[in-house]
């Protein structure tokens, strides 16, 4: 979030002093509340970061993102026969990063015509409720479905009504405590205009009373609460889940399990790379240097880590992908532009034609042939 | 001290053009926004120009716009003033001023001597 | 665009005496309003910037006040050299306008 300085402060700020704070006086006339931009706020607003490099990152996630999780979502719902509680998770990721990416085409006009918001204070509202909403749901179906992924190998037990019953209940919880976190950002006003530059901002410019003590107990807790101890558990699921598959015998089938694991666990841990920790971190940091210093060194990376945070939605495909073999299907078969009817009746033709071979080749032969399809 | 020295005025016939100079000291030049303000003979003031502190973007009058053109050298903490099919309506003193962006607005808090442009035939 | 009436056109006041120039802006322009004083043969000096905030190195007597679209300048303590005219300038609304001044004398 830009702030601008005050007369008093020194260097290059990015507060956005209030000056007149907003309240009804007893006359019942409202005065309004003044939010500071200074010349480097301006040029951050105007310049290349937030006019260029995030419209280009935004337009990648939204091309990427809205088919493949439109396509996992389909596939969860209604090509997926067991509703595994992997299942569960992956098509609440898949529909968290939906909510998301739906409204991107706003946030790139945004950013492309000088960072001005035409669209009203609710859909701006909404926009940033969803995108902070996205990222920790994000975390926290991820961390389900690592902890389940975890499990399933512990203890491979087949798919149970039961089971499917908790993971959605888990997902309920999960929405309705996302709703919950991340309330202040609907309540709090977030668009600013900004009569020098002609444009009214989007969760860019922020009051400063608001700021520097709120924003940064706020995103610390969410910060501790919804990204550190997730993290740990997942990385606690994936630590446990290695060891697991190193002990395990080794077989042609469990090869390929682990292999599929090993590249789960690390695209997971891309996303917490490049996605989640640092936009964690620097909210925390940008905030807290607010709070102390009175200006943040630190905003253009944090405005890069906001807008790589958004990259998950991208990553998510690739983790269903390792996942869930439904998905992997429909996957390979939408990059070759195949129906999966198609694709099942090749096998099944293919399939007989190998078993019609294979018994001819039974009776002439005495040794035992272990067959894999 | 902040000092702005205007420069380019004079006369010009109609439809001809003229840039206008204005050199800054005394301040951060690549830091600051940068404006012209003019004043015919006997008259009000009228805004005309603004360039922001990158360059990255100008404002003008729907009277100038098209004409007019405002730019910025800040290796030479330099002001310009392109000014193209000139009209007699134009004749004014033109001021350079230095504009603070304070609680989201531009205030002119300094102001140079001004240059006189007369356009006549 | 945004009209900026000022009022009176122009007024004289003894030394000491308090004085006050009224500005209407067309329609609300939420504080973003600054003063300027003209003496003659020089160069505008900025007042007041966002309605009632004082520029460094001006006189305290100088005051301004309003919201909405009716702002005020008020000088407290009438000085020779407070002479000259005043002008008052909308910056929330491109283009940026500015009134028609009000010269003040000293009576």
């Known amino acids: 979030t830009i702030q601008g300085t005050n007369r008093s402060s020194k260097g290059r700020s990015l507060i956005g002093k209030v000056d007149g704070t907003s309240h009804v006086t007893g006359k019942g006339v409202t005065v309004e509340t003044v939010f500071s931009v200074d010349e480097f706020s301006a040029s951050v607003l105007t310049g290349k970061l937030t006019t260029v490099f995030l419209p280009i990152v935004y337009t990648i996630v939204f091309v990427v993102g809205l088919p493949s999780n439109g396509m996992a979502l389909w596939v969860f719902l209604f090509r997926t026969k067991k509703k595994h509680p992997a299942v569960i998770y992956m098509a609440n990721l898949a529909l968290a990063d939906l909510l998301s990416v739906i409204w991107f085409p706003l946030k790139i006009a945004y950013h492309i015509h000088g960072n001005n918001w035409i669209y009203g204070e609710a859909l701006c509202n909404v926009l940033i409720g969803f995108f902070y909403g996205n990222m920790y749901c994000s975390i926290l179906f991820m961390t389900c479905l690592s902890v389940q992924r975890y499990w399933v190998i512990v203890n491979p037990m087949g798919h149970s009504r039961k089971k499917a019953n908790i993971a959605i209940g888990i997902s309920l919880a999960i929405w309705l405590l996302i709703l919950l976190v991340t309330i202040p950002l609907y309540v709090v006003k977030q668009t600013i205009f900004i009569p020098a530059l002609n444009i009214t901002t989007c969760h860019d410019v922020l009051p400063e009373q608001l700021l520097v003590g709120d924003m940064f107990n706020y995103f610390l807790s969410l910060a501790i609460g919804v990204f550190l101890f997730p993290a740990f558990l997942t990385a606690s699921a994936y630590v446990l889940m290695i060891r697991m598959l190193r002990s395990s015998a080794m077989d042609e089938n469990s090869e390929k399990k682990r292999k599929r694991a090993i590249k789960l666990i690390v695209t997971v841990l891309a996303m917490y790379l490049i996605c989640f920790t640092p936009s964690n971190l620097l909210l925390v940091v940008h905030y807290f240097l607010i709070k102390s210093q009175g200006q943040s060194h630190v905003y253009a990376l944090y405005i890069v880590a906001l807008c790589l945070s958004t990259l998950n939605s991208c990553i998510d495909p690739f983790v269903y992908y390792f996942v869930s073999h439904d998905f992997r299907d429909h996957a390979k078969n939408a990059l070759l532009c195949r129906s999966v009817r198609t694709v099942k009746q090749m096998q099944v033709s293919l399939t007989s034609k190998k078993h019609s071979r294979k018994s001819s080749s039974y009776s002439s032969s005495s040794t035992t042939v272990k067959t894999s399809y | 001290e902040v000092q702005l020295v205007e420069s380019g005025g004079g006369l010009v016939q109609p439809g001809r053009s003229l840039k206008l100079s204005c050199v800054a000291s005394?301040?951060?030049?690549?830091?600051?926004?940068m404006t012209w303000i003019r004043q015919a003979p006997g008259k009000g003031l009228e805004w005309i120009a603004s360039?922001?502190?990158?360059?990255?973007?100008?404002f003008y009058p729907d009277s100038v716009k098209g004409r007019f053109t405002i730019s910025r050298d800040d290796a030479k903490s330099t002001l310009y003033l392109q000014m193209n099919s000139l009209r007699s309506e134009d004749t004014a003193t033109y001021y350079c001023?230095?504009?603070?962006?304070?609680?989201?607005?531009?205030?002119?808090?300094?102001w140079g001597q001004g240059v006189m442009v007369t356009v006549s035939s | 665009d945004i009209q900026m009436t000022q009022s009176p056109h122009s007024l004289s006041a003894s030394l000491g005496e308090g004085v006050s120039i009224e500005c209407l802006a067309s329609e609300g322009i939420s504080n973003y309003l600054a003063w300027f004083q003209q003496k003659p043969g020089k160069s505008p000096q900025l007042l007041i910037y966002?309605?009632?905030s004082l520029q460094d190195g001006v006189p305290s007597r100088f005051s301004g006040s309003g919201s909405g679209t009716q702002y005020s300048l008020k000088i407290s303590n009438m000085q020779p050299e407070d002479e000259g005219v005043y002008y008052c300038q909308q910056g929330y609304k491109y283009p940026w306008t500015f009134g028609g001044g009000t010269k003040l004398e000293l009576k």
């Open positions: 360039i922001t502190n990158t360059g990255g973007r100008t």
């Open positions: 966002y309605a009632s």
């Open positions: 001023t230095r504009a603070t962006i304070r609680r989201g607005a531009s205030y002119f808090d300094y």
């Open positions: 005394g301040f951060t030049f690549n830091n600051k926004w």
